[in-house]
Interface confidence: low
């Protein structure tokens, strides 16, 4: 039976329950590497606290669908009599990245997983030519998620003091010329993920191999490499290579760029401070505040919850936008879809789409940019289910007693993005991390 | 009737080459993200070659750099060209088809053998 997903193939990837200390190692294609859990397992699951292994799935025991894979095992976990044996369930649903497999629930039996990836997409517009795994687990079973920072066009321009060279990089996959063709970037050759341009010419200095990899609990690293022999005529001989660390600052701090902190042969070191290294749960959460010895801010966006089933509306062009931020109150133009964001046609009101639902909400505050995303929509063409991202602005003399109205920015491959100038954007800082 | 049809295979010394064919009907070709796969004796199938419906390509680490994919929307085809061939490239190679309306569609194999 052929590999259901060839893309995700190449590595083993990690999971974790936070709740009861298990880390997960997923190979959908083969088996983990690991002798505990036996030559077959796919899903192996490492208990910290008893400081035992169990495979909970195995690879000869695949079953696949377009948006499936279960492993089942030959262990009865004996429910009641029945003849149920333990296995692993992984949802894949369309994403915009590789992205990374989570851990939502373990019954007696099954391990659940959802895993929002391109390899699940029924096109292929976010498919990558390379792209490697871009989260980490820290010694303390805490995640650090690079894939915000992946540009799915376009690349990033490293902070460098030559002024005849310009390098460009994306993070954990190759720059996407052909989506964005800048006018810098239209030369560099595909596959590249650190482009070096110099006058005219483009030359791809470096390509993703492995994951990235944590070094200390606050410096994750990246190592590209020019794949092909081949010299450089400029690099003396050496195959150019990149290597990009990114450190969590040490408090709460706005965006920098990637920095150029060395070069010889070929050889670039970059550094690049940004929050997006920092564990997830210093960045996020699933409701709409942010507070807590582990934020250090304090932010809280539910009093722009709306009641009374009134919505705000954001104007598109050709479509309305009823939002519902912050709560579970449903938009009465959205049937029923469980909507915090609401997308109707302006020229037929019964074409009506979720552009995200109120219980798939993510609060972000990182790098000093407040974002609400609700994602889980309706489904478009390419299987990516339709999301939005809120970008919210501190505005102190905003009106609707302060809580100011979402504005409509554009959309890009089934995402909405707004912006919304409130004071209840105003973040408090606590020093202290 | 939506149809793949692998042709190309035979036999070929090692260091050799071929090109095998799959010729699509039924389908709007240049929707179809294009991929080949190949099976030998006794193992599982693996993934060799993956051509996305906007051009992009990849490879499986074991024939980079000495098999190419590529494709032509006028007849409807795409090909896998294959040099440098090794004995353990010997398998049945199969084309698919992953449109984003159907679900996926298989050929039915075509034999490469690399023997001296």
């Known amino acids: 039976q052929a590999a259901p997903f060839p893309e995700l193939c190449s590595y083993t990837w990690e999971a974790v329950d936070t709740k009861n200390n298990v880390l997960y190692k997923i190979n959908i294609c083969g088996s983990v590497d690991i002798v505990q859990c036996g030559p077959s397992s796919a899903v192996c699951m490492h208990d910290l606290k008893t400081r035992t292994y169990h495979s909970v799935g195995d690879s000869v025991l695949r079953s696949a669908t377009r948006s499936l894979l279960e492993f089942n095992t030959t262990v009865s976990c004996d429910q009641q009599g029945t003849n149920h044996r333990v296995q692993s369930s992984i949802a894949f649903l369309c994403g915009k990245t590789l992205g990374t497999p989570e851990f939502v629930t373990a019954t007696f039996c099954v391990h659940y997983f959802e895993w929002r990836t391109t390899a699940a997409c029924k096109k292929d517009i976010f498919k990558a030519n390379k792209e490697v795994p871009c989260y980490v687990f820290d010694e303390e079973l805490r995640k650090h998620d690079l894939n915000p920072l992946i540009k799915l066009s376009g690349a990033y321009l490293v902070d460098d003091s030559d002024p005849d060279t310009s390098l460009f990089i994306n993070v954990c996959r190759d720059i996407d010329t052909l989506r964005d063709p800048g006018s810098q970037l239209r030369a560099c050759p595909p596959g590249t993920a650190a482009c070096l341009v110099r006058g005219h010419q483009a030359f791809d200095v470096g390509q993703p191999r492995d994951g990235l990899k944590v070094v200390r609990k606050d410096r994750l690293v990246l190592s590209y490499v020019r794949e092909e022999a081949g010299k450089l005529d400029f690099c003396d001989g050496h195959s150019p290579a990149v290597t990009i660390t990114f450190v969590c600052p040490s408090e709460r701090r706005e965006g920098t760029i990637p920095k150029l902190t060395a070069k010889s042969n070929c050889r670039y070191e970059i550094e690049w401070i940004t929050e997006y290294a920092c564990h997830r749960d210093y960045l996020e959460s699933k409701t709409c505040s942010l507070s807590g010895e582990q934020q250090d801010v304090s932010i809280d966006l539910t009093p722009l919850a709306q009641s009374g089933g009134s919505s705000y509306i954001s104007d598109g062009k050709e479509y309305l936008f009823y939002l519902n931020v912050c709560g579970e109150t449903e938009i009465q133009f959205c049937n029923k879809k469980q909507a915090a964001v609401c997308q109707v046609k302006k020229s037929d009101t019964s074409q009506v789409k979720a552009a995200g639902r109120y219980h798939n909400q993510t609060l972000r505050y990182s790098d000093g940019d407040l974002t609400l995303i609700y994602f889980g929509g309706d489904e478009c063409s390419s299987g990516f289910q339709r999301m939005s991202v809120i970008n919210f602005e501190c505005n102190k003399t905003a009106g609707n007693d302060g809580k100011g109205t979402p504005v409509f920015t554009g959309e890009v491959d089934c995402t909405y993005f707004f912006t919304w100038d409130t004071e209840y954007a105003c973040v408090h800082h606590h020093h202290h991390h | 009737q939506v149809q793949l049809q692998e042709s190309g295979g035979g036999l070929v010394q090692p260091g050799g080459s071929l090109r095998l064919s799959c010729a699509a009907s039924g389908i709007i070709f240049s929707d179809n993200r294009m991929d080949w796969y190949r099976q030998a004796p006794g193992k599982q199938r693996e993934w060799v070659a993956t051509?996305?419906?906007?051009?992009?390509?990849t490879y499986a680490d074991s024939v980079k750099g000495r098999f190419t994919i590529s494709r032509d929307n006028t007849k409807n085809t795409v090909y896998l060209r294959m040099n440098s061939l090794k004995p353990e490239d010997t398998a049945v190679y199969y084309c698919k088809a992953s449109s984003p309306v159907l679900n996926d569609i298989w050929g039915q194999g075509t034999q490469v053998t690399v023997s001296s």
């Open positions: 051509l996305a419906s906007y051009g992009w390509k």
